[in-house]
């Protein structure tokens, strides 16, 4: 017989199955091209001196063999005498150590026993009820498959799993999803319902992130507020990178974790947009407002846990930048304008109260007035800053108020609301003798002193009731006592105190009468 043909003679060894545990197994036969076929098998046991014979019986009952020698794979053509269009039965007989070992038989039609392709092209990955679902287009002309997957993590070896039978134009597989580690998957297919069909190669790796993206471990710092009223947010520590299985290292689409920065500007709640999401690599400039900053990690399955920080407001104040004039119609604020067409946000809140009680007002875009100032006015009826208490005022500016990262701080300062001149009048003025020609005048601190930078000075007025002469004595805003000297005994005096702001003269306190008694010598 020619080696390329199936030999229709008795094989050159006795026909007896030893029944031993070793021997040939896992016979697979399939078409590999238009006119060529291949059978391959495994051999269990010592391989020295083993000869393999591929046996074939046709539907007519005639049988033949191919001698494979020590090889466990054999190819033949459709001209080799094996009927490829009709059902044949194949098995392997291995002659070793004077005995024959037989594999299990496979019965098939060779012409349509095809070695399948693995999933090709795009494998779509999604999450379904806590499991991983993979889906792909069935390779052309290869509907009907058994599908297996194997998967590994960075620290574990391959584990095998079964996707079950597939019989459609698209195939899918449910696989385990790890909570906290990335996985590499590969898939393979073989013809369904065909005895002895062979597995395809493994597919290209499919890299899958953990269900929960890693929590970002980052730290921020915020620079000092610059002259432009902005401060830079900087990242002190980069997020840790996800550990990947071997086949996913380098280019691993699917396992990417994206980190985004979510800014929430807490100040100026009347502006149009309070939050903005940015890429973590693009660190923004912020105004001096208070912010909450969150870093959100997400992968193809969605967002994970986020980490949140609070950036407190910059409380550096500009005591002189804001002018406030109170008229009969209402109050107007003036401050140095930033540029043309600026929108300003004026925010105020009573000092010592929760930031949640801040009130604000947004101006229409405005240009500087001839003096280069920007203004904001309100009527008494509006009730804005109407109570006689200390308010903390911050003014923010933006040429693009809809863009959260383009706000800047113009100024922060304190203002005493309501009728400040009356409310600030010092109370409890008392006079005590100090010496033969002097007295000490004391008073309770003005309410204005609770407002940093508002109280410019106290003025103490002393009036000689005889001569009607008046003297005024300025006193530092931090002091609540002054000594009046050069007084004459037996003369009646009145003393009054007032508290002045930079733009408002205060109201005098009630006159306090006193005199220095004449000392009579014995």
């Amino acid at each position: 017989c020619r080696t390329s043909e199936c030999c229709f003679q008795d094989p050159p060894y006795p026909d007896a199955d030893s029944g031993s545990a070793s021997g040939p197994r896992d016979l697979r036969c399939y078409r590999i091209s238009s006119d060529r076929y291949e059978c391959s098998w495994q051999y269990e046991g010592p391989t020295a001196g083993v000869s393999h014979f591929l046996r074939c019986c046709l539907s007519s009952g005639r049988c033949c063999y191919f001698a494979a020698g020590s090889a466990t794979r054999l190819q033949f053509s459709d001209q080799a005498g094996v009927s490829v269009l009709y059902t044949v039965t194949l098995w392997v007989e291995s002659w070793a150590r004077n005995q024959t070992e037989k594999s299990p038989e496979v019965t098939l039609q060779l012409y349509n026993s095809v070695k399948y392709e693995p999933p090709l092209g795009d494998i779509k990955v999604s999450k379904l009820a806590g499991q991983l679902r993979m889906e792909w287009e069935t390779p052309d002309n290869q509907v009907g498959a058994e599908v297996q997957f194997r998967h590994r993590t960075p620290s574990s070896p391959w584990k095998l799993g079964d996707c079950g039978p597939q019989d459609d134009d698209t195939e899918s597989c449910l696989c385990p999803l790890e909570m906290n580690v990335a996985q590499e998957f590969q898939l393979r297919r073989r013809q369904l319902g065909s005895q002895g069909s062979s597995w395809s190669k493994w597919s290209s790796p499919v890299c899958v992130p953990p269900e929960n993206p890693p929590q970002p471990q980052v730290r921020f710092s915020v620079e000092q507020l610059g002259q432009d009223g902005r401060r830079r947010l900087t990242l002190k520590e980069q997020p840790t990178q996800l550990e990947l299985p071997e086949g996913c290292q380098g280019l691993a689409p699917g396992t990417e974790v994206t980190y985004r920065l979510q800014l929430h500007m807490l100040s100026c709640p009347c502006k149009a947009k309070a939050t903005r999401t940015l890429h973590l690599g693009k660190m923004p400039y912020l105004s001096g407002a208070a912010y909450n900053v969150a870093v959100i990690s997400s992968n193809q399955f969605g967002p994970g846990l986020n980490q949140t920080w609070h950036i407190p407001a910059d409380t550096h104040t500009e005591p002189v930048a804001l002018n406030i004039s109170v008229g009969t119609n209402g109050t107007t604020m003036y401050w140095p304008a930033r540029a043309q067409s600026m929108t300003y946000c004026i925010e105020w809140q009573p000092v010592g109260q929760d930031g949640g009680l801040a009130t604000c007002s947004l101006t229409a875009p405005q240009d500087p007035d001839p003096a280069g100032m920007a203004t904001y006015s309100w009527s008494r009826e509006s009730g804005a800053m109407g109570q006689e208490k200390c308010y903390y005022i911050t003014i923010f500016a933006s040429a693009h108020p809809e863009k959260l990262t383009l706000w800047s701080t113009v100024l922060s300062t304190y203002h005493f609301g309501g009728n400040a001149s009356a409310a600030g009048t010092p109370h409890h003025v008392s006079v005590k003798n100090h010496s033969l020609d002097s007295v000490s005048v004391d008073w309770a601190p003005s309410l204005l002193s609770t407002c940093p930078g508002v109280l410019k000075e106290y003025v103490v007025r002393c009036r000689d009731e005889d001569s009607k002469q008046v003297s005024e004595h300025p006193v530092q805003p931090t002091e609540t006592q002054v000594t009046l000297s050069g007084l004459r005994a037996g003369v009646a005096y009145t003393v009054q105190v007032r508290a002045d702001t930079a733009w408002l003269r205060g109201v005098w306190s009630q006159p306090q009468r006193f005199s220095i008694e004449v000392q009579v010598s014995d």
Partner: nanobody, 115 residues
């Protein structure tokens, strides 16, 4: 589900030609194997020609060199070109499709070769 409709059968003289068509109701990209079988009354169906995996062709020894199987993916159709017909080619010709583990058959078309 795949419906198959054959056409092109008829009466032809020995030595003549016929072209059979088998139109599938869905894309033949999803069909693993398409083949033509024939049956003479009282006998078993015989596989005549097959096209596997979209490209690989096989023929029964009795028709090799005379019959050609081909497919038109755009038309979802498989053809059997039969030349140099002989009286023993007279039979009902059936189109068959294997999609996964499912088998689909057409209703058949009669071919008669007679002078």
């Amino acid at each position: 589900e795949v419906q198959l409709v054959e056409s092109g059968g008829g009466l032809v003289q020995p030595g003549g030609s016929l072209r059979l068509s088998c139109k599938a109701s869905r894309s033949i990209f999803s069909i693993n194997t398409m083949d033509w079988h024939r049956q003479v009354p009282g006998k078993q169906r015989e596989l005549v020609a097959a096209i596997v995996n979209g490209v690989w062709k096989n023929y029964a020894d009795s028709v090799k060199g005379r019959f050609t199987i081909s497919r038109d993916n755009a038309e979802n159709t498989v053809y059997l070109q039969m030349n140099n017909l002989k009286p023993e080619d007279t039979a009902v010709y059936y189109c068959h499709a294997k999609r996964g583990v499912s088998d689909y058959w057409g209703q058949g078309t009669q071919v008669t070769v007679s002078s």
